[in-house]
């Protein structure tokens, strides 16, 4: 299997996460997308994912994870406002494309929340922000389920992510409807 | 075909104000994050200025902060520089680009020159 | 700020040769890095994305690789319109950063 590698992110509780997933646009642009947390002896799963097909810009809200799929650019926006310590944890990103397995991202991200004041920018964080509101229109897609998984063997698009601290307090309900999906590596 | 094209460059004095606009085609605007870069004579690429397509986020360089504002009207497909408080430094071609993050497609740049 | 260095800042070629180019990140941008090619008079023209994806209608010979903090931008034989002036830029973290450019010159 193809060893996957991770990315650590240290943030404060009320920060927000912005994972930008490159994806061949050729390939991928309207495929089904998602955002899984990986726990230790666990299967991943799914907190959230794109519709099916995937609708270019539109944003998609499961609690505090909203997903922006921009079939124009290639990019995966996933953004996880106002942190909480039991957000810490493995993240990734994945590709749907069934029949076949979803393509998994080398560069996992290890999320770490600290409590503490988040008041005053970090050395990660992003200074130059004047605008942060959350869409107050989004739609919740259901994520597929798959339950025969094999080897990933190519390698699939990558991801980074980079932290902001919204101007206004976000308050929005905890991720809901956790659905398993099996590992693929 | 994409389509960028500016205008509103020339040249101002120091302390002046300038408009730059962007008239976009060939894609669907409003699903599109836009943005700003500069480019001073001879020398490499800057980034300026980008905006979500809605208008909810909007992000500066340190340099032109509260100088610049960078908006749009998806009804026209136009995206706006206003530049005020202008420096030499700030002379510049500015490219009117598609993205936010990254820059798919490029206008043709409009040439800023701030001289006394 | 996520500065980028790029090397060498010019690079004498001959057609049909090999020409490898550097992009150093002062911190980690995992792979959301670009590059773009410029030609004198001409605005700049996107290539690679997510440090190895061409981009729609790049030529094969144009590749890309790394992660983290260090990335290779490659062409495997240039041709005459290859020539021009190569930049990397970052899109981990606004603001967003491009490196000073390396010239791919005639030699």
């Known amino acids: 299997a193809t060893k996957l590698t991770e990315e650590k992110y240290e943030l404060k509780e009320g920060q927000t996460l912005d994972v930008k997933c490159d994806y061949t646009l050729e390939k991928f642009a309207s495929s089904q997308k998602a955002w899984q947390i990986i726990r230790d002896g666990e299967m991943p799963k799914t907190l959230a994912c794109t519709e099916r097909p995937s609708k270019n810009s539109h944003p998609v809200q499961v609690g505090r994870i909203i997903l922006e799929d921009y079939h124009d650019h290639g990019l995966l926006r996933v953004r996880m406002v106002n942190l909480q310590v039991e957000d810490s944890g493995l993240y990734q990103c994945v590709i749907y494309q069934p029949p076949k397995e979803p393509h998994m991202l080398f560069d996992r991200i290890r999320l770490v929340v600290t409590k503490g004041f988040s008041g005053t920018p970090g050395s990660n964080e992003n200074s130059t922000q004047n605008v942060y509101k959350i869409p107050p229109t989004t739609t919740k897609a259901l994520c597929p389920l798959y339950t025969s998984p094999r080897t990933v063997t190519q390698a699939p698009p990558k991801s980074t992510a980079d932290v902001s601290t919204p101007d206004s307090e976000i308050n929005l309900t905890n991720v809901t409807d956790i659905i398993r999906v099996p590992v693929f590596n | 075909e994409v389509q960028l094209v500016e205008s509103g460059g020339g040249l101002v004095q120091p302390g002046g104000s300038l408009r730059l606009s962007c008239a976009a085609s060939?894609?669907?605007?409003?699903?599109?994050?836009m943005s700003w870069v500069r480019q001073a004579p001879g020398k490499g690429l800057d980034w300026v200025a980008s905006m979500k397509q809605d208008g909810s986020e909007i992000y500066y360089v340190d340099s032109v902060k509260g100088r610049f504002t960078i908006s749009r009207d998806n009804a026209k497909n136009s995206l706006h520089l206003q530049m005020n408080s202008l420096r030499a430094e700030d002379t510049a071609v500015y490219y009117c680009?598609?993205?936010?993050?990254?820059?798919?497609?490029w206008g043709q740049g409009t040439l800023v020159t701030v001289s006394s | 700020e996520i500065v980028m260095t790029q090397s060498p800042a010019t690079l004498s070629v001959s057609p049909g040769e090999r020409a490898t180019l550097s992009c150093r990140a002062s911190?980690?941008?995992?792979?959301?890095l670009a590059w773009y090619q410029q030609k004198s008079g001409q605005a700049p023209r996107l290539l690679i994305y997510g440090a190895s994806i061409r981009a729609t209608g790049i030529p094969a010979r144009f590749s890309g690789s790394g992660s983290g903090t260090e990335f290779t931008f490659t062409i495997s034989s240039l041709q005459s319109e290859d020539f021009a002036v190569y930049y990397c830029?970052?899109?981990?973290?606004?603001?967003?950063?491009f490196g000073g450019g390396t010239k791919v010159e005639i030699k």
């Open positions: 830029q970052q899109y981990k973290n606004f603001p967003l950063t």
């Open positions: 680009v598609r993205g936010g993050w990254r820059f798919e497609s």
């Open positions: 060939g894609f669907t605007f409003s699903s599109n994050w």
């Open positions: 911190q980690s941008v995992s792979s959301n």
